[in-house]
């Protein structure tokens, strides 16, 4: 099944591997965490993927953290779990959903300037896939802490959303992460329906902006499960 072996390169949302597309002839629209199979005008979603294994929070999506799926479970078996919403219990910042941080064991709303975590001095990409630079330079990127006086602009390499400028989040782009725009009202978003269901999205989207949530578009309620379009909508 999908994601059972990372090196098999069987990746969720393929093709669309991407977490969604615009609706126009010759493309399907997907915001659901399945796989869309293009073929004429018919698309079906397969929802039998496995949770994405991880070693650290940075390997998970913006709305997930890395932990053992069972309380007191085997520390060696960790997967990406859905982030904890406001007022939920937590042990560290990464457990809390974007816009929140862990304070006294509870996820609370963070102010704009709250830094969600220490920045590692070095980014190393730990996936089994080859990622060569187009100019042949080293893959290892050392980040000077001085760089972080100015937050990352769109397209900058990042480790987490706090590395990015206001209005941007840190989202996966192939086997790296870059700053991408936080989604605005009406934009297509990716809804992860099950805890740990998210897997590895090669072209990951940001989360919806403040005051917005990712919900099924009203005129898509009647559509089949496979074609339900999620967009950022006012609470």
């Amino acid at each position: 099944t999908l994601n059972s072996v990372l090196n098999s390169n069987a990746i969720k949302n393929l093709p669309p591997p991407l977490g969604g597309a615009a609706g126009h002839p010759g493309s399907a629209v997907s915001a659901a965490p399945g796989i869309l199979y293009p073929g004429g005008n018919k698309y079906q979603t397969i929802d039998n993927y496995q949770p994405y294994p991880c070693a650290e929070d940075e390997e998970c999506g913006t709305d997930e953290y890395c932990a053992s799926p069972t309380r007191g479970g085997d520390a060696g078996v960790q997967i990406c779990l859905a982030c904890r919403k406001r007022r939920k219990r937590c042990m560290r910042h990464a457990m809390c959903c974007p816009g929140n941080y862990c304070k006294n064991g509870i996820c609370v709303s963070s102010d704009q300037n709250h830094f969600r975590g220490e920045i590692e001095e070095t980014i190393t990409e730990s996936f089994g896939n080859d990622h060569s630079t187009l100019d042949g330079y080293s893959r290892r990127t050392t980040l000077s802490s001085k760089m972080y006086h100015t937050k990352g602009q769109e397209g900058s390499v990042c480790l987490r959303s706090s590395d990015c400028a206001s209005g941007l989040c840190c989202a996966r782009h192939f086997w790296s992460k870059i700053c991408k725009p936080v989604l605005k009202e009406g934009q297509v978003c990716t809804k992860h329906r099950r805890k740990g269901s998210h897997g590895l999205e090669i072209f990951q989207r940001c989360y919806c902006g403040e005051g917005l949530s990712c919900r099924i578009q009203k005129d898509h309620h009647q559509a089949s499960n496979s074609s339900r379009l999620h967009t950022c909508q006012r609470h």
Epitope: P16, L18, G20, A21, S27, H131, F174, Q187, F203
Partner: nanobody, 117 residues
């Protein structure tokens, strides 16, 4: 809206070569990068190769490393996949996909590649 059109697929003998092209039209936003994916009959989709305009990097699946080369021109909205030393197990429909900065992702209809032994 962005439309992706793949070409260059076909029937080739094992050990042969093919060059796939993918042209994007209608782009109004910048693209972060493009990639090639494939689906063989009865199998799941898999990532083949990708190119990030943003980071200036290329990415390959282990199964094609050293045989396939992705290249492209962001200004011309085009990406290529040079496939050498083709094997029967490379037989699949190959799809081109694009990650756009407008939060939409697009892909083409696919092109069939058949490698005979």
């Amino acid at each position: 809206e962005v439309q992706l059109v793949e070409s260059g697929g076909g029937l080739v003998q094992a050990g042969g070569s093919l060059r796939l092209s993918c042209a994007a039209s209608g782009r109004t936003f910048s693209s972060y990068g493009m990639g090639w994916f494939r689906q063989a009959p009865g199998k799941e989709h898999e990532f083949v190769a990708g190119i990030s305009w943003t980071l200036g990097r290329t990415y390959y699946a282990d199964s094609v490393k050293g045989r396939f080369t992705i290249s492209g021109d962001n200004a011309k909205n085009t990406v290529y996949l040079q496939m050498n030393s083709l094997k029967p197990e490379d037989t699949a429909v190959y799809y081109c996909a694009s990650n756009e900065s407008d939060a939409y992702n697009y892909w083409g209809q696919g092109t069939q590649v058949t490698v005979s032994s």
